[in-house]
Amino acid sequence: VPRWRQQWSGPGTTKRFPETVLARCVKYTEIHPEMRHVDCQSVWDAFKGAFISKHPCNITEEDYQPLMKLGTQTVPCNKILLWSRIKDLAHQFTQVQRDMFTLEDTLLGYLADDLTWCGEFNTSKINYQSCPDWRKDCSNNPVSVFWKTVSRRFAEAACDVVHVMLNGSRSKIFDKNSTFGSVEVHNLQPEKVQTLEAWVIHGGREDSRDLCQDPTIKELESIISKRNIQFSCKNIYRPDKFLQCVKNPEDSSCTSEI
């Protein structure tokens, strides 16, 4: 008799999830000498242990602690780049500017980037059919809890000047409900972090507005200031030129406003 399976509103676990995580771990530890000591089989076992046989709406940060411990990594705390709703540009930037890091440049972020996963209560099966949607089903699902956990730890580790890339094309440039707005902002440590600097990325080619004056940016400034952290903001008017100048900063056109 086929067993009844809960139908969730979100997409199911990414196909070949175990193989993907293991392969990514091996690749990352080969590229990053400081993580060569990591045993990728143990990493996968800890990852699996966080959600397998557990109800996918009842996952806690505690479930991920064994994985967090194995994936402990020191990144330069003053070279952290956060982002919200503009992941691709942030990643393109750190691929060129190799001494700055997004969460996805760390082992744990790299392992899980763009993947979905969940299990089922009381069975060792991975659910490839559907997984809980954060809004429609539950917030304490395996993927959301993972990102909340690693994002909190990443923000807690930051020091000095922290940068965040924000999407100036969105109606809410700063969104309190994003991971950045709900987790990272509140976990920056005022005793370590001097300034949060926002880079607002413009979308339109002829958009010369000062998006640092946007009401949602003012809201971000207010939240940050109340936490005794200074705030500054910079418009990136031409993201294409910005990236080009990161690649070729000796070009004479790169000393003007980007």
Epitope: Q97, V161, P249
Partner: nanobody, 115 residues
Amino acid sequence: QVQLVESGGGLVQAGGSLRLSCAASGRIFSINAMGWYRQAPGKQRELVAAISTAGSTNYGDSVKGRFTISRDNAKNTVYLQMNSLKPEDTAVYYCNLNFPPYVYWGQGTQVTVSS
């Protein structure tokens, strides 16, 4: 913040040489490019030479073959060796540090070439 301290400017005769230095200090991430620009009275600031961390260089047309830019990444310092100087090289020479989207400028050092 970031400070740029230039040195090595002065008065030199046409055909002579000078070596400019610029040291960067302060909160530096990764100095993507350091370089030299110059501004003569009544003219716009123009590129003299720039060099990326990796060593890619870019020279202004009027100095190619005469000026050489180099850098010491460990010391966050850039150098400009100026040979076969001409009176038209007379200008204030500004050190530049470019970490997009940040651009920093030094205070400038005067180079005067007499004929």
